[in-house]
């Protein structure tokens, strides 16, 4: 069968060959596609509920007047010249629909480098058959699943149309110390051969580099934190950082109900000072960072304290 | 919303002519094939005629054929029925309808108008 | 011409009986037949398009079967609203035959 690809809503000629240029012919057109089941024959004196889809011309082609998605499938013509002898045609016919021009939708302007960010979502609409989105990164392909690219798509079909609406969501890691202004877009590649790519505008988002949190540290007095009844302790928060973050305490876990401070002193130690204390540095420009906990414990006249704090957190205390 | 609305129906005494017409509203009137059915009084439903959209075409049964001649004026949302000849057979409720061919038949019809051939 | 015989051409039933009216075509017409609702001095309405799928608005108790060239036309419980005549029409081929309809009464 010869194939043939015709566009959506244009006219489509087929050629009956061997057939008399004009009547009387003997003839008879057969298609099997989305609009029969099975075979439908069509011959010359037709004329009827078929001729909005399809009909025999004088010359004894078939005309398709606006081609539909419906009318894939095959056509075949049988037709008898004027000495008896009998010709074939055979037509695989294929439609397609080149899309609108694809877009980049809810797309960011800037990344953050060594997590994951959403560049945007490409869209492309009204395509047959559905065809594929890619993306691309500085012209060159990107590989979902590989170095920190992954993509999420969705395929959705018009219920009246039946022309495809396709999305791809980008997530990215950006490197650190990578390219600054890096440049995505995304190309539109058609289902049916010898149609060329449509690729949308370019991105640029700018990709920030977030400076590395230097690590909050956490220092007891006595040192390992065990201290005879009745006894004082000094735990000073230590923050490298510009300007200086605000330093909540936690004890056990629970923030303690004190206002912000590097310093907190616990005097005239009881049994209830007991337990796991850490400090929470929060940063404006980042999240919160809390540092290790170290356990403050009583020590009985004669016992020996341990030598270092262990992990834990909280009592209330003073503030200096 | 869609809508169809026929008029000119009446009574006509055999031999005469009438020219029936049918408003089309709230759709694009020439994306559709148009069709004409009668119901004889106490009958069933005949098609009488169909034409293209583009109005290149018309369709017509053999008991109307060279009688009955289906026009359209797309500029005008306007399906057009223009019955000569008229036999007491003729005497129906003419109703007009939106389709028909393979893609779209009848899924809307007009009220109906009512044409008596009597003398 | 493709005669388009359906039967019953009348029929008694109760409400929330199942009901099924049959055309048959003369010829094969692959999926191409309609059915349509009839009420006295109405317009007809358009039930079930291309042998199997509900025309919008029309509720899901209506349903339409093919085989081969039977056309079947089911009311699954029928309700007092579908006491009316019913057609089949063939519209593969011209000129476009309606069967001779079917009056579904109260018993």
């Known amino acids: 069968a010869q194939n043939i690809t015709a566009r959506i809503g244009e006219p489509l000629v087929l050629k009956c060959k061997g057939a008399p240029k004009k009547p009387p012919q003997r003839l008879e057109w057969k298609l099997n596609t989305g609009r029969t089941e099975a075979w439908k024959v069509l011959s010359p004196q037709g004329g009827g509920p078929w001729d909005s889809v399809a009909r025999v011309l004088p010359n004894g082609s078939l005309f398709l007047p606006a081609v539909g998605i419906q009318d894939e499938g095959i056509f075949r013509c049988q037709a008898m010249n004027r000495n008896g002898k009998e010709t074939k045609s055979n037509y695989r016919v294929r439609v397609y629909q080149i899309p609108g021009k694809p877009e980049i939708v809810d797309s960011a302007s800037e990344l953050t480098a060594g997590v994951p960010n959403k560049v945007g979502t490409c869209v492309s609409e009204g395509s047959y058959p559905a065809g594929t989105l890619s993306w691309h990164l500085d012209g060159k392909p990107l590989v979902p699943n590989e170095k920190g690219v992954s993509v999420k798509e969705q395929t959705r079909r018009h219920p009246e149309t039946g022309l495809f609406t396709l999305q791809s969501e980008l997530m990215v890691t950006p490197a650190r110390g990578g390219d600054p202004r890096p440049t995505f877009s995304c190309s539109f590649s058609p289902g049916l051969p010898r149609h060329r790519a449509l690729r949308t505008a370019p991105i640029q988002p700018r990709v920030w580099e977030p400076v590395p949190l230097e690590e909050v540290q956490l220092v007891v007095e006595p040192e390992g934190g065990a201290v005879a009844p009745g006894g004082t302790v000094t735990l000073t928060c230590e923050v490298p950082a510009q300007p200086s973050p605000q330093i909540h305490w936690m004890k056990d876990g629970v923030p303690l109900p004190l206002p912000p401070s590097p310093v907190l002193i616990l005097p005239e130690i009881g049994p209830q000072d007991q337990g796991t204390y850490s400090c929470v540095a929060t940063h404006s420009s980042h999240g919160p960072q809390e540092s290790r906990a170290v356990s403050i414990s009583i020590i009985e006249p004669g016992e020996e304290g341990p030598t270092a704090g262990s992990v834990g957190g909280s009592g209330l205390g003073t503030l200096a | 919303e869609v809508q169809l609305v026929e008029s000119g129906g009446g009574l006509v005494q055999p031999g005469g002519s009438l020219r029936l017409s049918c408003a089309a509203s709230g759709f694009t009137f020439n994306n559709y094939w148009m069709t004409w059915v009668r119901q004889a009084p106490g009958k069933g439903l005949e098609w009488v005629a169909s034409?293209?959209?583009?109005?290149?075409?018309?369709y017509y049964p053999d008991s109307v054929k060279d009688r009955f001649t289906i026009s359209r004026d797309n500029a005008k949302n306007s399906l057009y029925l223009q019955m000569n000849s008229l036999r007491a057979e003729d005497t129906a409720v003419y109703y007009c309808?939106?389709?028909?061919?393979?893609?779209?038949?009848?899924?809307?019809w007009g009220q109906g108008t009512l044409v008596t051939v009597s003398s | 011409d493709i005669q388009m015989t359906q039967s019953p051409s009348s029929l008694s039933a109760s409400v929330g009986d199942r009901v099924t009216i049959t055309c048959r075509a003369s010829?094969?017409?692959?999926?191409?037949v309609n059915w349509f609702q009839q009420k006295p001095g109405k317009a007809p309405r358009r039930l079930i398009y291309r042998a199997t799928n509900l025309a919008d608005g029309v509720p899901s108790r209506f349903s339409g079967s093919r085989s081969g060239t039977d056309f079947t036309l089911t009311i699954s419980s029928l309700q007092p609203e579908d006491f009316a005549t019913y057609y089949c029409l063939e519209f593969d081929e011209h000129p476009l035959t309606f069967g001779g309809g079917t009056k579904v009464e109260i018993k």
């Open positions: 034409i293209d959209n583009s109005g290149d075409n018309t």
């Open positions: 010829q094969d017409v692959g999926i191409y």
């Open positions: 309808a939106r389709g028909g061919d393979i893609r779209v038949m009848l899924d809307v």
